[in-house]
């Protein structure tokens, strides 16, 4: 399938959104910060087929969403932003849905590449750690909030090359 | 193609103050930081400070808290940086930068510079 | 502040050669996995370009012959081959705390 111009522009907008949700100044989390092992090599469009591009893709943005539906999450960010934020998420969600159907019947390839599912929930368990780790205090989710951006512009330069592989 | 367009050439009395001003384009404006860097001639480079220009919020070098303010409009994607009460130690090229790679903080484009020149 | 100290002030290599130029941090600029030192390369009458984010990752569209490395207080950058056009004075500058600084130079010539 074509990934849709509108699902790139769907990202920028979470990236907007998500910028836009910062609550405290990030200069006082300096000591903060974390390395949280972004699988950078999952993003890379080259080395998958499609299908399975597609689903690395949908795994980051389903644990995304997950984990900005806690309580937790709740409770850290403006709510007004943080539904907009989750809604954005939700439709790119059914975008790609609907993409693994069409696609599903033109490849050969099996539908998931589980070692890089696997890679993209551990990612996403060591963000959960290092929230419950740091009590979920104000500059432990600012510190995931630029890395969650961080993750999800890599995700957007895959949609790029993906898009340029058609 | 991302863009900082800075303002030219100024020439200042000591004791006066000058307002610089960066232009940004290619990107979103609101959602990075933008930074400020000093170069004396000759010399290295010295952070002066960073703002966010989607809600204004600022983070200084203690050195220039008194020396340099940031602000910025967002509708007309522009940063300023004004610096008050200049002596010929503040005669330098400034560079407007942006923000990179979130909280590694970082600098990938830079504005061509604005010279600031204090002579009586 | 963290001071950052760069050596040697300058050097002269012969074209594909190796530069290597040291940055000593006062304090340590590394934290729970990452090293929060970048390095910069700015040529006569233009502005600085970053090459080396995080003490080792190159920066895109920056040639392979760069690369970086080091940890806590001592980073490298290294040049291999050199070329003509890497004349230029290069800065480390890192952001492990405010106020984040810059290294005072190193000026590579090519002979």
């Known amino acids: 399938c074509d990934l849709p111009q509108t699902h790139s522009l769907g990202n920028r907008r979470a990236l907007i959104l998500l910028a836009q949700m910062g609550r405290i100044s990030p200069f006082s989390c300096l000591k903060d910060r974390h390395d949280f092992g972004l699988p950078q090599e999952e993003f890379d469009g080259n080395q998958f087929q499609k299908t399975q591009a597609i689903s690395v893709l949908h795994e980051m943005i389903q644990q995304t969403f997950n984990l900005f539906s806690t309580e937790d999450s709740s409770a850290a960010w403006e709510q007004r932003l943080l539904e907009k934020f989750s809604t954005e998420l939700y439709q790119q969600l059914n975008n790609l849905e609907a993409c693994v159907i069409q696609e599903v019947g033109m490849e050969e390839t099996p539908l998931m590449n589980e070692d890089s599912i696997l890679a993209v929930r551990k990612y996403f368990q060591r963000i959960t750690l290092y929230l419950t780790e740091k009590k979920y205090s104000p500059c432990a989710w600012e510190v995931v909030r630029a890395e969650i951006m961080r993750s999800l512009s890599f995700s957007t330069n895959l949609q790029k090359r993906l898009r340029r592989k058609d | 193609q991302v863009q900082l367009q800075e303002s030219g050439t100024v020439l200042a009395r000591p004791g006066a103050s000058v307002k610089m001003s960066c232009k940004a384009s290619g990107y979103s404006f609101t959602t990075y930081w933008m930074h400020w860097v000093k170069q004396r001639p000759g010399q290295g480079l010295e952070w002066i400070g960073v703002?966010?220009?989607?809600?204004?919020?600022?983070t200084y070098n203690q050195k220039f808290k008194d020396k340099a303010k940031l602000t910025a409009v967002t509708s007309a994607n522009t940063a300023y940086m004004e610096l008050s009460s200049l002596t010929n130690e503040d005669s330098a090229v400034y560079f407007c930068t942006r923000n990179y790679k979130y909280d590694y903080y970082t600098m990938d484009y830079w504005g061509q510079g604005t010279t600031v020149t204090v002579s009586s | 502040d963290i001071v950052l100290t760069q050596s040697p002030a300058s050097l002269a290599v012969s074209l594909g050669q190796r530069a290597t130029i040291s940055c000593r941090a006062s304090k340590s600029v590394s934290t729970s996995g990452h090293s929060y030192m970048h390095w910069y390369q700015q040529k006569p009458g233009q502005t600085p370009k970053l090459l080396i984010y995080?003490?080792?990752n190159l920066e895109s569209g920056v040639p392979a012959r760069f690369s970086g490395s080091g940890s806590g207080t001592d980073f490298t950058l290294n040049i291999h081959p050199v070329e003509e056009e890497d004349a230029a004075t290069y800065y480390c500058q890192h952001s492990g705390e405010l106020p984040f600084t810059f290294g005072s130079g190193t000026k590579l010539e090519i002979k």
């Open positions: 703002i966010y220009p989607g809600n204004g919020d600022t």
């Open positions: 995080l003490a080792s």
